[in-house]
């Protein structure tokens, strides 16, 4: 669809005259007539296929034509046309003389002909006008024409049909060869895809209007490109949704199960190393000169009883100092300047000659000891206490302290491992002599039931539309995570448009 | 069940400070991003600021930003917005949620969402 438009610039007849020679009275009062038909190699009368305009009066005898309205016709003239213009054309103009105010042609004499032109040829679409000047005898017309494009129709031919728009279904304006121009932050075939903003990842996100990044369950972030963790997740992280990868140290369906107790409490003192052995178990490996379980008791150096044949112990800053009794010397007072003259042995002790008396060596009676039998016997020296157990002596008994998961006088009894209910989820707990071993219900696995193993609600493909499926740990449902285009709790529904806010 | 509860809200002068709480229950705060949200007599909401999950990036409104600071207690499971330098302009019932869509200066859809506190500022 389009528009031939002529334009008439000049007519020029001097003499005032029809095409009979005879002269108009009082003057050749002129109007056109115009016709445009299919191309013919000869311009013959017959139908204007094309169309056919008439002017009004425009002037008498020669005049210039104002390129608007002009006594109520049109400058230049329109001739529309429904269908793909073919490229070529025939043009009939026609000028006549108006004795009277009727135009119609069965009103006007047949010698009221002024002059009569014909042209033919090709003509391509565009703006631009072609000037052409027709010259007779008595009369010379100038004008230019041109076709154009109706409006909403494009291309070489005005054959394409594109009309802008900015709805749901399309954002475009038109080119001039009809192809569709996406306004900013549309794309696709017919701009009715937007664009989201920039980054927006491709699976995780997507976007109802341009600019924005919508997250699909699971994503969040400006990019939708962080996942949400399993509800309940404490010490983990994930790299898809509902997921909880536990960080370094931690444990447990939540990871909030203590693995690494030597970092997180630092329960050890006094520069102690610390080694984790378990779920919130550690043990500390004391420096010298402390004890306890978490090495937090200083040891008195004169604790261990260095000092022999009754030398007495100091303790001192930098360690101790063995003050010895008579006829005794040397650190520990290991050295004796006395023989069996000088009745050393204690406690009923017997003494014996060595090196020909410049030695001797005391059999001490049972419950005593010491080169000069001057100590009681220690009654941790026989190490009594089991399973690791340290000794005290405390006056004329002794007792035991026991390592973490023992008890009993000697440390003998072995602390049920299973008395802190450690099987998670229900799991039946046995004591074995090195630990204990869980038993799990359907459904859980590891060496504590903590593993979720429970049938993969995914297995089914329950996501239509090709969409991702995620299995819910908590709920043992799944999650469908739908491609662009689709909603629902399935993926099941093409996309319409999701309200912006929840009000 | 999820709750967010806003807290802080109240009546103050043209130039004074308020300080807003959102208690969180029900879901695990500290994996989310959040958002607090205002909505202004016969307007439509408007985003103020966000967080992301772990309190080190932080997003403003050019209308908010420089006056208020917006922070997160993972601990205590509670996000908080600080109001400095409040004009009457900032009057509106102010809601904290989860952002669950973004657009290119702020979140404007949301998934989980509190019952709102009014803040009033006279002039």
């Known amino acids: 669809s389009g528009v031939f438009q002529l334009q008439l610039q000049e007519f020029i007849n001097e003499r005032g005259v029809l095409a009979s020679g005879r002269p108009c009275e009082p003057g050749c009062r002129t109007f056109f007539r115009v016709c445009l038909k299919h191309f013919q190699a000869v311009v013959s009368p017959g139908p204007c296929t094309f169309g056919t305009v008439s002017t009004p009066v425009l002037g008498t005898n020669s005049f210039a034509v104002r390129d608007d309205s002009s006594g109520g016709g049109r400058n230049p003239l329109q001739l529309p046309f429904n269908f793909t213009w073919p490229g070529t054309f025939s043009l009939i103009i026609e000028a006549w003389h108006a004795p009277g105010d009727d135009l119609r042609p069965e009103a006007l004499p047949p010698d009221a002909l002024i002059s009569k032109i014909a042209i033919q040829g090709s003509l391509a679409v565009g703006q631009n006008w072609l000037l052409d000047e027709q010259t007779s005898t008595l009369t010379r017309l100038r004008y230019s024409y041109r076709v154009i494009c109706s409006d909403n129709y494009y291309g070489d031919n005005c054959s394409r049909l594109c009309k802008k728009r900015n709805d749901h279904f399309g954002h475009y304006v038109c080119q001039p060869d009809g192809n569709l121009s996406c306004l900013p932050g549309w794309t696709g075939e017919y701009c009715q895809q937007p664009i989201c903003l920039s980054g927006c990842h491709e699976q995780n996100g997507y976007c109802s209007k341009p600019a924005e990044c919508l997250c699909r369950p699971g994503w969040q972030g400006r990019l939708c490109n962080e996942c949400i963790p399993h509800n309940g997740c404490r010490h983990g992280t994930c790299s898809t949704p509902w997921q909880c990868t536990c960080d370094e140290g931690w444990g447990g369906l939540f990871c909030d199960q203590d693995l690494n107790y030597c970092t997180h409490h630092s329960p050890c003192k006094n520069g102690a190393t610390c080694s984790n052995s378990g779920q919130r178990s550690y043990t500390c490996t004391c420096r010298p000169g402390y004890t306890g379980v978490d090495c937090e008791l200083e040891l008195s150096e004169c604790d261990s009883n260095p000092c022999r044949n009754g030398g007495s112990c100091k303790d001192q800053e930098d360690g101790y100092h063995c003050l010895c009794p008579p006829g005794y010397y040397g650190l520990h007072c290991e050295h004796s300047t006395l023989s069996c003259a000088d009745s050393p042995c204690f406690n009923g002790g017997s003494c014996r000659e060595r090196n020909q008396g410049a030695n001797y060596a005391c059999e001490c009676p049972p419950n005593f000891t010491g080169s000069n039998c001057e100590k009681k016997v220690d009654r941790c020296t026989s190490n009594p206490c089991a399973n690791g157990g340290q000794c005290l002596n405390r006056g004329p008994s002794r007792m035991c302290r026991c390592r973490p998961g023992f008890t009993g006088t000697y440390c003998e009894l072995h602390v049920s491992d299973c008395a802190r209910n450690p099987c998670a989820h229900g799991g039946t707990c046995h004591d074995l002599e090195n630990g204990l071993m869980c038993t799990c219900p359907a459904g859980f696995s590891g060496r504590r039931c903590e593993v979720r193993t429970s049938i993969d609600a995914c297995a089914s493909s329950p996501c239509f539309n090709r969409a991702t499926c995620y299995t819910d740990l908590s709920t043992d449902t799944f999650v469908c995570n739908c491609p662009y285009g689709f909603v629902g709790s399935r993926c099941e529904f093409p996309v319409g448009l999701p309200p912006s806010f929840p009000w | 069940e999820v709750q967010l509860v806003e807290s802080g809200g109240g009546l103050v002068q043209s130039g004074g400070s308020l300080r807003l709480s959102c208690a969180a229950s029900?879901?695990?705060?500290?994996?989310?991003?959040m958002s607090w949200v205002r909505q202004a007599p016969g307007k439509g909401p408007e985003w103020v600021s966000a967080i992301n999950s772990g309190g080190g990036i932080t997003y403003y409104a050019d209308s908010v930003n420089g006056r208020f600071t917006i922070s997160r207690d993972n601990t205590k499971n509670t996000l908080y917005l600080q109001m400095n330098s409040l004009k009457p302009e900032d009057t509106a019932v102010y809601y904290c949620?989860?952002?669950?869509?973004?657009?290119?200066?702020?979140?404007?859809?949301?998934?989980?969402w509190g019952q709102g506190t009014q803040v009033t500022v006279s002039s």
């Open positions: 949620a989860t952002p669950r869509g973004w657009g290119p200066t702020g979140p404007h859809e949301y998934g989980y």
């Open positions: 029900g879901f695990t705060f500290g994996s989310y991003d």
